[in-house]
């Protein structure tokens, strides 16, 4: 939602967290700003304090409940407002009618581990975190492997078009250090975006056996 010269973007993690970023052109004086969440069909409302992440943008997380509680559904609409203090009053800076399941960004996958490693191959698994049971199997993943001498940006993306929480990396070089990351995205939602990348998992392929190719 854009109001005046500000931009207000929020994502739902599918369970009990709405993360918001508000950016404002032109520096604001030292003032206290909050995001207020008012669902249309729930008894609760929630507030979080916006904290600076850069000179002209602020972020906060609306914690709606325990991490794995299902606090919103696809029929919910949450009115989100940015409110800033001026004098003793609050002034509304931005507003949006937020449809949580149209604006999804899941938590980064967790518990990455090497299941089996060989000279040229490595089997890796992971788990998704705080993802709604509503998705059933309607998730996709992207993965990337960091090779020596390259950057993450140069790493080719591997796409898994189904809910598959493992991957078998092939054509690796023996006795070489690699890093691996994965991210997840629900298929649902017009403005849904990829989760952050997982923490990198470091692994090393086995050395080639002596006297063999």
């Amino acid at each position: 939602a854009v109001n005046g010269t500000s931009r207000f973007t929020c994502f739902y993690n599918s369970r009990a967290n709405i993360s918001c970023v508000w950016s404002q052109d032109g520096a604001l004086q030292d003032t206290s700003c909050q995001v207020h969440a008012w669902p249309d069909r729930r008894r609760w409302n929630q507030t979080c304090e916006l904290l600076p992440v850069s000179q002209a943008s602020w972020a906060c997380n609306l914690i709606l409940g325990t991490p794995d509680s299902q606090k919103l559904t696809a029929v919910d609409i949450v009115t989100l407002r940015v409110m800033c203090r001026e004098g003793v009053r609050w002034r509304m800076m931005a507003i949006q009618d937020f449809k949580p399941f149209e604006n999804l960004r899941l938590m980064a996958p967790i518990s990455l581990q090497v299941v089996h490693v060989e000279t040229h191959r490595c089997n890796i698994s992971w788990k998704i975190s705080q993802a709604s049971h509503y998705f059933e199997r309607h998730l996709e993943f992207e993965a990337r492997t960091l090779s020596p001498g390259h950057t993450w940006e140069e790493a080719p993306l591997m796409t898994l078009k189904q809910k598959q929480e493992w991957i078998c990396l092939e054509t690796l070089t023996p006795d070489t250090q690699y890093e691996f990351q994965v991210r997840v995205k629900p298929l649902q939602g017009e403005f849904t975006t990829w989760s952050p990348w997982s923490q990198p998992l470091a692994f090393r392929t086995k050395p080639a056996a002596l006297g063999k190719d």
Partner: antibody
Framework: EVQLVQSGAEVKKPGASVKVSCKAS????????ISWVRQATGQGLEWMGE????????YYNEMFKGRVTMTRDTSISTAYMELSSLRSEDTAVYYC??????????????WGQGTTVTVSS | DVVMTQSPLSLPVTLGQPASISCRSS???????????LEWYQQRPGQSPRLLIY???NRFSGVPDRFSGSGSGTDFTLKISRVEAEDVGVYYC?????????FGGGTKVEIK
Amino acid sequence: EVQLVQSGAEVKKPGASVKVSCKASGYTFTDYVISWVRQATGQGLEWMGEIYPGDGNTYYNEMFKGRVTMTRDTSISTAYMELSSLRSEDTAVYYCARGSYTYDNYAMDFWGQGTTVTVSS
Amino acid sequence: DVVMTQSPLSLPVTLGQPASISCRSSQNIVHSNGNTYLEWYQQRPGQSPRLLIYKVSNRFSGVPDRFSGSGSGTDFTLKISRVEAEDVGVYYCFQGSHIPWTFGGGTKVEIK
């Protein structure tokens, strides 16, 4: 019906202090802000600052900082404005006015009848 | 602070005729949220001020439709389409966009 009833006229000597009261009725006192505005004789209006009775938070116009104190007593739905170190140019009518806690539309919708403060030696 | 300058200082009008009051701000009073918090207050003789117009052009409840507000940026106008006897008094513009909030010096409307 919303009403703001202010205390009566005051005559003060230079250097003294004056405390004006503003009793609210017809609405929930702690849900709205009370602003104070003054009008020197034959002059325009000057916004002095305001208090939010819900938590007692205040904001003062820099022009009056150090001399003005705004307080409230929620048990009797009354706001107070005290001005110290009075000088002749503080002779004015002092108004309290109600304002919304969230400034969505306007600053002040209902006003008190005003309190005349005369500073004279 | 934002200085609000009103003109004319005094406005003699004939009953039933239109009247127009100008208010100019020393800087743009569009708030960073995109709204312009320009208000008009009427003060009849011996009375307290009364809110007429908010956010440039919105009439407050109970205000007759002969009062209208317009303008943007730094230039604003209050119009009375047909002046009635009860419209006599001083009219103040007010900006609530930049703290400290400030009033104009006032325009006195009187009957010719």
